[in-house]
C-alpha cells in the first residue's frame, strides 16, 4: 500500500553542476495524495537553511507527481551552494535532502568574451 | 522483476580499453545511484564511482580518478564502466549495484564482469 | 578517506549458535540529515554480494530475520542469532555517508 505521507523526491548527496548566466530551474518532486502541500526552498548557510523570500518559484503537475521549482534566470556565482525544499503537511514539516549546485562563472573560468565582444570582433567567428 | 544484467566476460591486452555495460530493469534508474565496484582476485570489494543517471552527475573514488569514465543512457536504462589503457592489475571482477537515491529503500547488484587483462 | 575495519578477519561458528561481527570506522558516519549510512552485504562463494542491512539496523525485503544490524556513530556490529548452513559468506561493511565510499575488508564466515 502506497504511503500517504508528503514524499520529497531528491536525491541524497545530489549535484547539478551549471554554469553562471544560464537559465536554470531547481526541481523538488512532490508526492502527495490529496491536498497539495504548501513547499519552500531554503539554502543552506552552515547547518541552518535560510528560507528563499521573494524568489521565482512555480507548480508543475505531472501524472504521479507535482514538481515545485526555485527558478534562476538567470544563474548568478553566488548561487552556489545547497538547497533544501521543505513541506508543510499536517502541521508536520517535511525536509528533502539537500542538493548542491556547483556554478561555474565562465567569464573568470576561460574569459570568454560577451556577446557584445564578439559582435565588435567578428574575426573570432571564423 | 528487478534485472540488473552486466556484459559478459572480456580478455583484453595491456594498452588497450573496454567499456563495461549494466542494463537495469524493473525500477526507474532516474531514482537510483549507479555505483561501479572492484573485486581483484581473492581480494575485498573496492568502490570505483557513482552516477546520477538523471542528470550525468558523476562522483569518482581519487584511486580511481582519471583511469575510468562512469557513464549513463537513462532512455536504455543502461550505465557504463569505461575501462582506458588496460593493466594486467586491471585484472578483477566489475560489479554495478543500483541504489535508491531518496530513501535507500532498495539496493540491487548486478551478477559482474570478468576482465581479463593479458599479453 | 575513512578507514572501515572489520573484525574479526575470519570467524567459525557452529550452526544454531550466534555470530557477531564488528565494523569500525575512522570517523562518524552520522550524516548532517541525523541518519547514518551504513551498510552490510553478503557475498556467498562465486555470487555477487547481496544488500543485507541499511541505515545501520534496516532489513532488506527478503532478508531472515535472524539477521540484525545495531549501532552509531563509529561502531556497528551485524548479528546473526542462529547460524545456519546458507549463511556460509564473506560479509562486508559499506559506508555512503561520505566520499569516497568505502568497505570494509571483509569477514569470512564459515561453519565449525
Known amino acids: 500500500k502506497e504511503s500517504c505521507d508528503v514524499q520529497l523526491y531528491i536525491k541524497r548527496q545530489s549535484e547539478h553542476s551549471i554554469l553562471a548566466g544560464d537559465p536554470f530551474e531547481l526541481e523538488c518532486p512532490v508526492k502527495y495524495c490529496a491536498n497539495r502541500p504548501h513547499v519552500t526552498w531554503c539554502k543552506l548557510n552552515g547547518t541552518t537553511c535560510v528560507k528563499l523570500e521573494d524568489r521565482q518559484t512555480s507548480w508543475k503537475e505531472e501524472k504521479n507527481i507535482s514538481f515545485f521549482i526555485l527558478h534562476f534566470e538567470p544563474v548568478l556565482p553566488n548561487d552556489n551552494g545547497s538547497y533544501r525544499c521543505s513541506a508543510n503537511f499536517q502541521s508536520n514539516l517535511i525536509e528533502s535532502h539537500s542538493t548542491t549546485l556547483y556554478v561555474t562563472d565562465v567569464k573568470s573560468a576561460s574569459e570568454r568574451p560577451s556577446k557584445d565582444e564578439m559582435a565588435s570582433r567578428p574575426w573570432l567567428l571564423y | 522483476e528487478v534485472q540488473l544484467v552486466q556484459s559478459g566476460a572480456e580478455v583484453k591486452k595491456p594498452g588497450e580499453s573496454l567499456k563495461i555495460s549494466c542494463k537495469t530493469s524493473g525500477f526507474n534508474i532516474k531514482d537510483t545511484y549507479i555505483h561501479w565496484v572492484r573485486q581483484m582476485p581473492g581480494k575485498g570489494l573496492e568502490w570505483i564511482g557513482r552516477n546520477d543517471p538523471a542528470n550525468g552527475n558523476t562522483k569518482y573514488s581519487p584511486s580511481f580518478q582519471g583511469q575510468v569514465t562512469i557513464s549513463a543512457d537513462k532512455s536504455i536504462s543502461t550505465a557504463y564502466l569505461q575501462l582506458s589503457s588496460l593493466k594486467a592489475s586491471d585484472t578483477a571482477m566489475y560489479y554495478c549495484a543500483s541504489y535508491e537515491g531518496y530513501y535507500e529503500r532498495f539496493g540491487y547488484w548486478g551478477q559482474g564482469t570478468l576482465v581479463t587483462v593479458s599479453s | 578517506d575513512i578507514v572501515m575495519t572489520q573484525s574479526p578477519d575470519s570467524l567459525a561458528v557452529s550452526l544454531g549458535e550466534r555470530a557477531t561481527i564488528n565494523c569500525k570506522s575512522s570517523?562518524?558516519?552520522?550524516?548532517?540529515?541525523?541518519?547514518?549510512?551504513l551498510n552490510w552485504l553478503q557475498q556467498k562463494p562465486g555470487q555477487s554480494p547481496k544488500r543485507l542491512i541499511y541505515l545501520v539496523s534496516k532489513l532488506d525485503s527478503g532478508v531472515p530475520d535472524r539477521f540484525s544490524g545495531s549501532g552509531s556513530g563509529t561502531d556497528f556490529t551485524l548479528t546473526i542469532s542462529s547460524l545456519q548452513a546458507e549463511d556460509l559468506a564473506v560479509y562486508y561493511c559499506?559506508?555512503?555517508?561520505?566520499?569516497?565510499?568505502?568497505f570494509g575488508q571483509g569477514t569470512k564466515l564459515e561453519i565449525k
Open positions: 559499506w559506508q555512503d555517508t561520505h566520499f569516497p565510499y568505502t
Open positions: 570517523q562518524s558516519l552520522l550524516d548532517r540529515d541525523g541518519k547514518t549510512y
